[in-house]
Interface confidence: low
């Protein structure tokens, strides 16, 4: 059976394609190509007799076909108005007229897209941006690269129009970018320049650095302020509600306890129009701001009830301290028997009774801040009373 | 998980002949320019091919026009070599390596493990 | 004779910074993207850096690229003892219509 091949099927624009033929009768007397699915004499491109080897120009010739001896058409720098089916009828030596219809697609060779923008300075949260692909092209599949990848699934990000727009919906401060659009058909393919987003955030709460709260008189309070912010924040502190400098860093060189209080960072953004404070107490004192774990001992930890007394004592090299004591996840002393000496370092029980056994721990404190001991545990035995009947055990 | 896997290397005498295949898997293989890169041994790279992801356009290096001839077969993930009147200077360990801009940006970004190419007699 | 030269060797020891240059012409770096591979000993080329200065994910940020007219630079921060391999710089180049390589530099990581 007489069949057509295109070579290639999808042709670049300008470029040339050749429409082979299969399977070409032996006896024949000639050929004719037409410009369509049918054989239609005013679409007839070219006409060509076998015994003269003459080839004769049809109504659709354009002067950039060519028949062969083999019945195949080459068609030069075609055009997208080439695109379409075109039949060949072979005018056999038994006058049977045999028909084969082929087709190629002519695609443009793509220019470099470009990408356009409805909000290149979007506010996060707030504003939405539509991208769009240009030029709009037929026949074109439109692709989108966000970061040099495939573009996430994401409720945020929405394709419409054929692809050739994307839009963001509610952008964030991550959503900068680059985008990149590709225009794909079967013959070409080109990427846009990559494009960046300005987004506008902030700013967030406030940081401020170093962490500190508590500060020697005579050192340096150098207190440093941070909030997230597009374009970046204006700062500006208040102390005690009193404000002070508009600078990012707050200095004050040789404090003193007057200095104590509360130290309030204030940003600003003015695109947005926000503001975000935070507030820091910084307390200037003597105080050791970190008190060391007690250590807690005893005379002796398993004792006889009724009998014997125990001293516990809670040593620790902090000055300037209170020291409490605890039995049970109760305060000390609860009994008449039970006494503290030595500023609270040492607690006496005299005699030990069966309820003092447990455990005891020690907590140091200032004002500012306290440690607890690790507990230790208080035995109390009884002598075994005498077996009845005068009966040994066994 | 992107792979490359050449295959075909092997000794050849000069002005023989052979045919290198490349395997791909772990990704669209039909959505990528695909090239082969040669290294001489105890030399630095050289580009020889690229064939774009859907075939119809090729390039080759200058010194083995005429000689070696790119192809893909994208219903079978594969890219070929076909090396004619081989030369004892086309030694080397032959890489396939894939381009993930479809050639806006050439560059190579998965490479396979090579296959080596004797011309000796 | 490559068509983009690069140094054949350059040193350094650990913790240091060392940069690699790649020098071309306008038909290659100078008009297209440049990529930076490493190549370790026995091994095939890994790709680092691509369109000038993009690192290829999973690639240490002490890797850098950069480029300036029709010359690309490549900066190893932090310099490591797996950082000891060949490093080749390649481009499009649109008049040979090919790909072509620098000539490679062997990095040695002294101490």
């Known amino acids: 059976q007489l069949t057509t091949e295109s070579m290639p099927f999808n042709v670049a624009e300008g470029k040339e394609v050749l429409l082979l033929v299969h399977n070409l009768p032996q006896q024949l007397f000639g050929y004719s190509w037409y410009k369509g699915e049918r054989v239609d004499g005013n679409r007839q491109i070219v006409g060509y007799a076998i015994g003269t080897q003459q080839a004769t120009p049809g109504p659709a010739n354009s002067g950039r076909e060519t028949i062969y001896p083999n019945a195949s058409l080459l068609i030069q720098n075609v055009t997208q108005n080439d695109t379409g089916f075109y039949t060949l009828q072979v005018i056999k030596s038994d006058l049977v007229n045999e028909e084969a219809t082929g087709q190629f697609h002519v695609y443009p060779e793509l220019p470099k897209p470009s990408i356009s923008s409805n909000n290149s300075n979007p506010v996060e949260d707030k504003d939405a941006v539509a991208f769009t692909c240009e030029p709009e092209t037929q026949d074109t599949t439109y692709l989108w690269w966000i970061n040099n990848q495939s573009l996430p699934v994401s409720p945020r990000l929405q394709l419409s129009n054929g692809n050739r727009t994307l839009t963001l919906l509610s952008v964030t401060r991550n959503d900068t970018g680059p985008y990149e659009c590709e225009i794909q058909n079967p013959v070409s393919a080109n990427r846009s320049d990559p494009v960046t987003l300005n987004v506008t955030y902030g700013p967030d709460t406030p940081t401020i650095s170093p962490s500190d709260t508590y500060y020697r008189p005579g050192a340096n309070l150098s207190l440093s302020c941070y909030a997230a912010s597009n374009p970046p924040a204006q700062y500006s502190w208040l102390i005690n509600g009193t404000f002070q400098q508009s600078t990012q860093e707050l200095f004050i060189p040789n404090i003193t306890v007057n200095n104590s209080g509360s130290y309030t960072c204030h940003a600003n953004n003015s695109v947005t129009g926000c503001n975000r404070t935070t507030v820091k107490t910084i307390i200037v004192t003597e105080l050791s701001p970190v008190v060391a774990k007690p250590q807690i001992k005893a005379s002796k930890t398993t004792v006889t009830g009724d009998k014997d007394s125990v001293n516990l004592t809670c040593s620790t090299n902090d000055t300037g301290i209170s020291i409490r004591w605890f039995f049970k996840n109760q305060s000390l002393p609860s009994s008449e028997r039970m006494k503290l000496s030595q500023g609270n370092t040492t607690l006496s029980i005299n005699p030990v009774k069966r309820e003092d056994a447990g455990t005891y721990w020690c907590e140091v404190f200032n004002p500012i801040s306290k440690n607890q001991s690790d507990p230790i545990m208080l035995n109390v035995n009884y002598n075994a009373l005498p077996q009845e009947n005068g009966l040994s055990p066994g | 998980e992107v792979q490359l896997l050449e295959s075909g290397g092997g000794l050849v005498q000069p002005g023989g002949s052979l045919r290198l295949s490349c395997a791909a898997s772990?990704?669209?293989?039909?959505?990528?320019?695909m090239s082969w890169v040669r290294q001489a041994p105890g030399k630095g790279l050289e580009w020889v091919s690229v064939?774009?992801?859907?075939?119809?356009?090729?390039y080759y290096a200058d010194s083995v026009k005429g000689r070696l001839t790119i192809s893909r077969d994208n219903s079978k993930n594969t890219l070929y070599l076909q090396m004619n009147s081989l030369r004892a200077e086309d030694t080397a360990v032959y890489y396939c390596?894939?381009?993930?801009?479809?050639?806006?940006?050439?560059?190579?970004?998965?490479w396979g493990q090579g296959t080596l190419v004797t011309v000796s007699s | 004779q490559s068509v983009l030269t690069q140094p054949p060797s350059a040193s350094g020891t650990p913790g240091q910074r060392v940069t690699i240059s790649c020098s071309g012409s306008?038909?290659?770096?100078?008009?297209?993207?440049v990529s930076w591979y490493q190549q370790l000993p026995g091994t095939a080329p890994k790709l680092l850096i691509y369109a000038d200065s993009k690192r290829l994910s999973g690639v240490p940020d002490r890797f850098s690229g950069s480029k300036s007219g029709t010359s690309a630079s490549l900066a190893i921060s932090g310099l490591r003892s797996e950082d000891e391999a060949d490093y080749y710089c390649?481009?499009?180049?649109?008049?040979?219509?090919?790909?072509?390589f620098g000539g490679g530099t062997k990095l040695t990581v002294l101490g």
């Open positions: 772990g990704f669209n293989f039909s959505n990528y320019a």
């Open positions: 306008s038909s290659n770096i100078g008009n297209n993207y």
């Open positions: 390596a894939r381009d993930p801009t479809k050639g806006y940006a050439p560059t190579f970004d998965y």
């Open positions: 064939i774009s992801h859907g075939g119809g356009s090729i």
């Open positions: 390649g481009a499009w180049d649109g008049r040979l219509n090919g790909y072509v």
